[in-house]
Amino acid sequence: HTAAQDNCTCPTNKMTVCSPDGPGGRCQCRALGSGMAVDCSTLTSKCLLLKARMSAPKNARTLVRPSEHALVDNDGLYDPDCDPEGRFKARQCNQTSVCWCVNSVGVRRTDKGDLSLRCDELVRTHHILIDLRHRPTAGAFNHSDLDAELRRLFRERYRLHPKFVAAVHYEQPTIQIELRQNTSQKAAGDVDIGDAAYYFERDIKGESLFQGRGGLDLRVRGEPLQVERTLIYYLDEIPPKFSMKRLTA
């Protein structure tokens, strides 16, 4: 079992319903919205998390929309279609039959079309650049200490191997975290960089997805690291296909 057995909860995803109805009375957790069983020893896929987020009652929602700066999805939140593994389906459509193609992190990568739009494959996002600006501090953080702390965070909290943290750049007050993960490099059981980036983004915004875990308290040598602005850029293995009209807008 991977859920917390004693009180049957999902430590890695609070947007679940858990009950001891698994094999041998083991705790089993299902994501809200999709009802899909999730592995609570690792991160839940972004697609299932977005679906759960959209299914939450509007009046009880404790999670807020991304800020105007977030480049996760310029189109804002949507209720995605997920495949049986919890990944985004390559083609997403809304209730008014407007469709578009997305990448593996669910970000639109084509112009919007109608139901005839074809999305042949789910294109993998293999490079994510997380751009942070921290609040003013007495002095700059030591670069190697900052690098070590961020790698520890991604390893221990998000279970992302440091080999997928390609680099940590720092020019006060800007921190850039580069996540890279080619299809060939990602082994079974490896956390996807898109899922790790999403959990990190939500943690930074004070909207932690973890069950009963304190909010993110980032410290470098005891000094609090408080983020005041986040931008996330996605690079796909195949470049996106937008019309020139959008590119020149």
Epitope: S41, R152, E156, P162, F164, A166
Partner: antibody
Amino acid sequence: QVQLQQSGAELVRPGVSVKISCKGSGYTFTDYSIHWVKQSHAKSLEWIGVISSYYGDATYNQKFKGKATMTVDKSSSTAYMELARLTSEDSAIYYCALLGAYNYFDYWGQGTTLTVSS
Amino acid sequence: DIVLTQSPASLAVSLGQRATISCRASESVDSYGNSFMHWYQQKPGQPPKLLVYRASNLESGIPARFSGSGSRTDFTLTINPVEADDVATYYCQQSYEDPPTFGGGTKLEIK
């Protein structure tokens, strides 16, 4: 400063089990997973597995599945490793350790010497 | 599992001379410019002590006579000049892939 304090040496009979401990101090215990490493004359250093101090779940080296069981007690900042059905091949020094930024072993316990003998 | 082959198994060097220890991995341990290879020193009765991380980065407090080099599958630890205090066993370790694995060790003695 970061310290990992391990339990004392053990002399046990073949076939029994033993549980060794590793108490962490000088850092936030749940911020770091605890790894266990075996050192024997025959096989140099071998990674046994890791337990998440926060989640409480363990990942084992295939070779030690069924031999080692790792647990953690957050309230006392202590990790435990139980070794079952002991044989002379389990005689070794067992270390607990914490990882650094690039998954090198940054901090080590002083080691627990296990001798299995009839 | 990634197998690390260290050579030589033992090494006798005169004080003030150079000691070179080699570690070969069964597959590449590099990822996006980072080599996930590390070196440790172990003295009798003590746990291993980190000397060099990521192939060539000297751990804080380690004397500059220790240096590491290499990439992909071939790595080297160099001690120059060797001092009496360097008598120990040296291990390489890869952390590119689970399970982490160690080399068989190289015992350094003074000639």
